[in-house]
Interface confidence: low
C-alpha cells in the first residue's frame, strides 16, 4: 500500500513519542561518536518536518524516502570528516548506495568510554529534573554502543528503565531497589544485543534463505500445532521485520513488528495455546512476550517422518517441484517433533537431507540411494549431546569462574592471534553457558546451550571481522553459519603460532585492583591468564593452575597489606620471576 508521504505514514502509525525515540536510535546507531545534543537537535528537526508532512502530505520533500530524508540529515553534521574519516564519503553517494555505505561503517566495537554508573541519588535527581532527556540519553548510550540493537525491543527496555526509576527513586532504600533492576536490564540488554547481532549477521552474511531456515526451525519448535502454511506466513513476516531493522529501517521495522504481534494475537487459535497471557499485554510487552514465549505442546500422534520424506515414492518429484518448500516442510516437521534439539542441529540435519536428495535424485535408483538418510543423522545428533554432557560435567566440577578459565586456555591455544580483550570477553561468555544451561533437564540442555554458543561465537566473528588476524577464525566464521560451533570445537592447538615475547609490564599490577568489583578483578586475572598462554602455549594445565593460584594469593596478600603499592611492586617482581621459572619462560 503506497503512501504519498512515507514519513507522515510512519509518524501517524507510531505516534510522536515512538517516532522520536526510533529516529534517535537510528541516528545514534549510524553516527556512534556524535554528542548526544547533536543527535537530539537532528531528531527534533526531523520530527518537526514529519509534522508538516502529516498536516500536508503534498508539502515539499514529503514524498522523499526515509533513507533520503535521514541520510540528508546525517550528512549535515559539520564534523563528519574529522570524526568519522572515510564514512564522510558516504555522503557523496546516492540512495540506496549511501545507506549501504552507512551500514558498512557501523562499528561493533566503537572506541567509546565504558558507561560508569553514577551514585543512585545523582541518577534520581537527573531523572526527576528532566525525565525526557534522561530516558533519551539511555536510548542514545545503548544504541551507539550496540549499533544492531533491535530497535523496537530497545523501546521496551527504555520503558522498563523508566519504570525502575519511577518506582525506586521514591523508595526508602533507593539503592537496594534500583541497583538489582539496573543490573538485570544491563545483563538482559547485552544478551538481547548479541542475539540480534546474530540475526543481522545471518541475513547480511548468509542471506535471506539462511535466516528463513533458522526461523522455520525455531517457530516450528515454538508453535508445533500451527500448520506449515501458517508457520511460513509468520516466517515471511518475521524476515521482513528483521531485514528492516538490520538494514536501519527502524520505523518500518517497529511498525511491521506491531502488525505481526497483532496478527499473531488475532490468530492465536491456529498458532499456539501459550499466547493468551502475552496477548493481553500492551504493545511493547506483548511483542517481547511473544518473542520469548515457551514452546507449545506437541500435537499427539504425529506420524513418522519417514513416510513422507524417505519411504514415499514421490520424494524426488516433490523435491524437484519446489525444493525450498519441500525442504521447509521437512524442517518444519522435524523441528516440531524435536524441541529437544538446537536450531543449528535441525539446520544441519536439513542440510544433510538436502545434500542427500541432490545426490540421490540424480541417481539410477533414487529410493535405494536415500533410503538410509536418517541413519546419517545419528552422529550429527550425538556430537552436540556428548559435548554438552562433557562440558556440563566440567562446569559442575569447577564452578563458573574456573570453567571460564578452562575455556580461556582452550580458545587461546586454538586461536592465539586474537586480541586478549576479545578472547577474555568471548571465553567469559562461553563459560556462562554452564550456569545458563547445565541446570536444565536433558531435554532442554541442547537448545539452550548450542543456540547460546552460536550467539557468543558470532560475537567473536563480528569482532574478528573488524580486524582479521586469524585465518582459522575467518574460516570457521564464514564457511557455514550452522557449523561454526563444530568448526571451533574441532580446532586443535595452533602449532604455527610463534609465542609472544615476554613483557613484564603485562604482569605488573597496582593497588587499584583492590578497589575493583569481583567481576573486574576476575577480568584482570583472566587477562593475565590469556597473556600467559600466549607466551607459553605449550604450558600444561597444572603449570597454569599453579601460576594462577600464586597470582590469586599475591593479590589477596597485597590487598590486605598496609602499604599496598609497595607490596604490589616488590611481591609482583617475585611473582613474575617465580612464574617465569615455573613455565620456563
Amino acid at each position: 500500500d503506497a503512501h504519498k508521504s512515507e514519513v507522515a505514514h510512519r509518524f501517524k502509525d507510531l505516534g510522536e513519542e515512538n517516532f522520536k525515540a526510533l529516529v534517535l536510535i537510528a541516528f545514534a546507531q549510524y553516527l556512534q561518536q556524535c554528542p548526544f545534543e547533536d543527535h537530539v537537535k537532528l531528531v527534533n528537526e526531523v520530527t518537526e518536518f514529519a509534522k508538516t508532512c502529516v498536516a500536508d502530505e503534498s508539502a515539499e520533500n514529503c514524498d522523499k524516502s526515509l533513507h533520503t530524508l535521514f541520510g540528508d540529515k546525517l550528512c549535515t553534521v559539520a564534523t563528519l570528516r574529522e570524526t568519522y574519516g572515510e564514512m564522510a564519503d558516504c555522503c557523496a553517494k546516492q540512495e540506496p548506495e549511501r545507506n549501504e555505505c552507512f551500514l558498512q561503517h557501523k562499528d561493533d566495537n566503537p572506541n567509546l568510554p565504558r558507561l560508569v554508573r553514577p551514585e543512585v541519588d545523582v541518577m534520581c535527581t537527573a531523572f526527576h529534573d528532566n525525565e525526557e532527556t534522561f530516558l533519551k540519553k539511555y536510548l542514545y548510550e545503548i544504541a551507539r554502543r550496540h549499533p544492531y540493537f533491535y530497535a523496537p525491543e530497545l523501546l521496551f527496555f527504555a520503558k522498563r528503565y523508566k519504570a525502575a526509576f519511577t518506582e525506586c527513586c521514591q523508595a526508602a532504600d533507593k539503592a537496594a531497589c534500583l541497583l538489582p533492576k539496573l543490573d538485570e536490564l544491563r545483563d538482559e540488554g547485552k544478551a538481547s544485543s548479541a542475539k540480534q547481532r546474530l540475526k543481522c549477521a545471518s541475513l547480511q552474511k548468509f542471506g535471506e534463505r539462511a535466516f528463513k531456515a533458522w526461523a522455520v526451525a525455531r517457530l516450528s519448535q515454538r508453535f508445533p500445532k500451527a500448520e506449515f502454511a501458517e508457520v511460513s506466513k509468520l516466517v515471511t513476516d518475521l524476515t521482513k521485520v528483521h531485514t528492516e531493522c538490520c538494514h536501519g529501517d527502524l520505523l518500518e521495522c517497529a511498525d511491521d513488528r506491531a502488525d505481526l504481534a497483532k496478527y499473531i494475537c488475532e490468530n492465536q487459535d491456529s498458532i499456539s495455546s501459550k499466547l493468551k497471557e502475552c496477548c493481553e499485554k500492551p504493545l511493547l510487552e506483548k511483542s517481547h512476550c511473544i518473542a520469548e514465549v515457551e514452546n507449545d505442546e506437541m500435537p499427539a500422534d504425529l506420524p513418522s517422518l519417514a513416510a513422507d520424506f524417505v519411504e514415499s515414492k514421490d520424494v524426488c518429484k516433490n523435491y524437484a517441484e519446489a525444493k525450498d518448500v519441500f525442504l521447509g516442510m521437512f524442517l518444519y516437521e522435524y523441528a516440531r517433533r524435536h524441541p529437544d534439539y538446537s536450531v543449528v542441529l535441525l539446520l544441519r540435519l536439513a542440510k544433510t537431507y538436502e545434500t542427500t536428495l541432490e545426490k540421490c535424485c540424480a541417481a539410477a535408483d533414487p529410493h535405494e540411494c536415500y533410503a538410509k538418510v536418517f541413519d546419517e543423522f545419528k552422529p550429527l545428533v550425538e556430537e552436540p549431546q556428548n559435548l554438552i554432557k562433557q562440558n556440563c560435567e566440567l562446569f559442575e566440577q569447577l564452578g563458573e569462574y574456573k570453567f571460564q578459565n578452562a575455556l580461556l586456555v582452550r580458545y587461546t591455544k586454538k586461536v592465539p592471534q586474537v586480541s586478549t580483550p576479545t578472547l577474555v570477553e568471548v571465553s567469559r561468555n562461553l563459560g556462562k553457558v554452564g550456569s545458563k544451561c547445565c541446570k536444565h533437564p536433558e531435554a532442554k540442555r541442547m537448545p539452550c546451550a548450542e543456540d547460546y554458543l552460536s550467539v557468543v561465537l558470532n560475537q567473536l566473528c563480528v569482532l574478528h571481522e573488524k580486524t582479521p588476524v586469524s585465518d582459522r577464525v575467518t574460516k570457521c566464521c564464514t564457511e557455514s553459519l550452522v557449523n561454526r560451533r563444530p568448526c571451533f570445537s574441532a580446532l586443535e592447538v595452533d602449532e604455527t603460532y610463534v609465542p609472544k615475547e615476554f613483557n613484564a609490564e603485562t604482569f605488573t599490577f597496582h593497588a587499584d585492583i583492590c578497589t575493583l568489583s569481583e567481576k573486574e578483578r576476575q577480568i584482570k586475572k583472566q587477562t593475565a591468564l590469556v597473556e600467559l598462554v600466549k607466551h607459553k602455549p605449550k604450558a600444561t594445565k597444572e603449570q597454569l593452575k599453579a601460576v594462577m593460584d600464586d597470582f590469586a594469593a599475591f593479590v589477596e596478600k597485597c590487598c590486605k597489606a598496609d602499604d599496598k603499592e609497595t607490596c604490589f611492586a616488590e611481591e609482583g617482581k617475585k611473582l613474575v620471576a617465580a612464574s617465569q621459572a615455573a613455565l620456563g619462560l
Epitope: T236, D314, V325
Partner: nanobody, 114 residues
Framework: QVQLQESGGGLVQPGGSLRLTCTAS????????MSWVRQPPGKGLEWVSA????????NYADSVKGRFTISRDNDKKMLYLEMNKLKPEDTAVYHC???????SSQGTQVTVSS
C-alpha cells in the same frame, strides 16, 4: 490468515472446457509450489497437478495429461487450471493447496454431464 479461494467451477457438457482460478492471500505465494487436488463424489482425494514456485516445473496426473494445464501469476497471487476435453469422470470438488498439502478451503464444484 492463510486463505485460498477457488472459483470458476460449474456444469459443463462432456468435451467442454472450464478455467479454475485460485486466489491466494496471507502468505508468500511466490515462494511456494502449488497443487490442484480433487475429490470425486463418494471417493477420496486425488492429486491432479502441481506447479513449482517459479513455474519451471509442472506435473500432471496421468488421467488429465494433455487435457489440463496448470499456470500461475505470482504478481496477482493467482493459480489457474485450464481444463479442456472434460469427461464425466472429472466431476469433483476441486481444491488448490500449498505444496502437496491437505485442502483447507471449500473448493469449487465441477460437474461434467450431458
Amino acid at each position: 490468515q492463510v486463505q485460498l479461494q477457488e472459483s470458476g467451477g460449474g456444469l459443463v457438457q462432456p468435451g467442454g472446457s472450464l478455467r479454475l482460478t485460485c486466489t491466494a492471500s496471507g502468505f508468500a505465494f511466490s515462494s511456494f509450489g502449488m497443487s490442484w487436488v480433487r475429490q470425486p463424489p463418494g471417493k477420496g482425494l486425488e492429486w491432479v497437478s502441481a506447479i513449482s514456485a517459479d513455474s519451471s516445473t509442472k506435473n500432471y496426473a496421468d488421467s488429465v495429461k494433455g487435457r489440463f494445464t496448470i499456470s500461475r501469476d505470482n504478481d496477482k497471487k493467482m493459480l489457474y487450471l485450464e481444463m479442456n476435453k472434460l469427461k464425466p469422470e472429472d466431476t469433483a470438488v476441486y481444491h488448490c493447496v500449498i505444496g502437496r498439502g491437505s485442502p483447507s478451503s471449500q473448493g469449487t464444484q465441477v460437474t461434467v454431464s450431458s
